[in-house]
């Protein structure tokens, strides 16, 4: 009957190529076989979905083909990678975990990871 706790890092710095990775870990109150993981972005109290994937425990995490997210799962831990980030995408990224099956359903929401994205300086034109 316990609530589900979700842990994620407080801060992550995206790479110069606009890629950010972080681990989302959840303490499962039950033996879930089907789990849904959603990444949400919170900006100015507005929340929008970045990507979502449902997976069966023991199987791989599969996002849609056009998703900017990829990930792998291991037990109660999900390794998430968000690609194509730009400076304007800097913000709080929340990991939401739902235990979909078997009953009961559980919802877990992390405190969010602040992802900082710095656009690379353009290379100066070089004369040959």
């Amino acid at each position: 009957c316990k609530a589900m706790h979700v842990a994620q890092p407080a801060v992550v710095l995206a790479s110069s190529r606009g890629i950010a990775s972080f681990v989302c870990e959840y303490a499962s109150p039950g033996k879930a076989t089907e789990v849904r993981v959603t990444v949400l972005r919170q900006a100015d109290s507005q929340v929008t979905e970045v990507c979502a994937a449902t997976y069966m425990m023991g199987n791989e995490l599969t996002f849609l083909d056009d998703s900017i997210c990829t990930g792998t799962s291991s037990g109660n831990q999900v390794n998430l990678t968000i690609q194509g980030l730009r400076a304007m995408d800097t913000g709080l990224y929340i990991c939401k975990v739902e235990l979909m099956y078997p009953p009961p359903y559980y919802l877990g929401i992390g405190n969010g990871t602040q992802i900082y994205v710095i656009d690379p300086e353009p290379c100066p034109d070089s004369d040959f």
């Epitope: 609530a3 589900m4 849904r36 449902t54 099956y101 359903y105 929401i109």
Partner: antibody, heavy 118, light 108 residues
Framework: QVQLVESGGGVVQPGRSLRLSCAAS????????MHWVRQAPGTGLEWVAV????????YYADPVKGRFTISRDNSKNTLYLQMNSLRDDDTAVYYC???????????WGQGTMVTVSS | EIVLTQSPGTLSLSPGERATLSCRAS???????LAWYQQKPGQAPRLLIY???SRATGIPDRFSGSGSGTDFTLTISRLEPEDFAVYYC?????????FGPGTKVDIK
């Protein structure tokens, strides 16, 4: 704008069936869990059922289990509640509600009245 | 099943006064999954507070939520005429999702 509109309520005899619909607009329907909540006259809110995302996972409150079926058609942006073997105590206003990104029921329909009476 | 109890059942106050509504859970509820709703006669419920303390979009700042564990509070700092209604708490962290019986705030 984001909106939910229920329909299908009415007066029905005990033991009969009724199907409620909830038409959604203004948001990506398939990205949200959808609930039915009811309110008997003069009483509080009672959660009835939920259906998640693609429609594979569904959960019901004990009083309706085995009698009610929740479903959705994501291509039509519509939520349904098939109510069979209706009883007097199913008389209520039935609301559909969206499970928001952070879980709370953030958007509600206006409700549709179901009266079970002989 | 998590049972929610609300008190008082009815709160009779005057406009401008402060309203304090209580919601108690039969077992610990994470504050991330506790909501408050307002319902006026003949209308659908409206989300006021989610995550125990975060105001929903468009909700005035006279509404505030607090609490953790099994005890939660909704406070209306200065009652406006439009605030007289029934208020429900709800837990949405696990199924079955449950509502409290409601507190009616009426005009004294």
């Amino acid at each position: 704008q984001v909106q939910l509109v229920e329909s299908g309520g009415g007066v029905v005899q005990p033991g009969r069936s009724l199907r409620l619909s909830c038409a959604a607009s203004g948001f990506t329907f398939s990205s949200y869990g959808m609930h039915w909540v009811r309110q008997a006259p003069g009483t509080g809110l009672e959660w009835v059922a939920v259906i998640w995302y693609e429609g594979r996972n569904k959960y019901y409150a004990d009083p309706v289990k085995g009698r009610f079926t929740i479903s959705r058609d994501n291509s039509k942006n519509t939520l349904y509640l098939q109510m069979n073997s209706l009883r007097d105590d199913d008389t209520a206003v039935y609301y559909c509600a969206r499970a928001g990104d952070l879980g709370a029921f953030d958007i509600w329909g206006q409700g549709t009245m179901v009266t079970v009476s002989s | 099943e998590i049972v929610l109890t609300q008190s008082p059942g009815t709160l009779s106050l005057s406009p401008g006064e402060r309203a304090t509504l209580s919601c108690r859970a039969s077992q610990s509820v994470s504050s991330s999954y506790l909501a408050w709703y307002q319902q006026k006669p003949g209308q659908a419920p409206r989300l006021l507070i989610y995550g125990a303390s975060s105001r929903a979009t468009g909700i005035p700042d006279r509404f505030s939520g607090s609490g953790s564990g099994t005890d939660f509070t909704l406070t209306i700092s200065r009652l406006e005429p439009e605030d007289f209604a029934v208020y429900y708490c709800q837990q949405y962290g696990r199924s079955p999702f449950t509502f409290g019986p409601g507190t009616k705030v009426d005009i004294k």
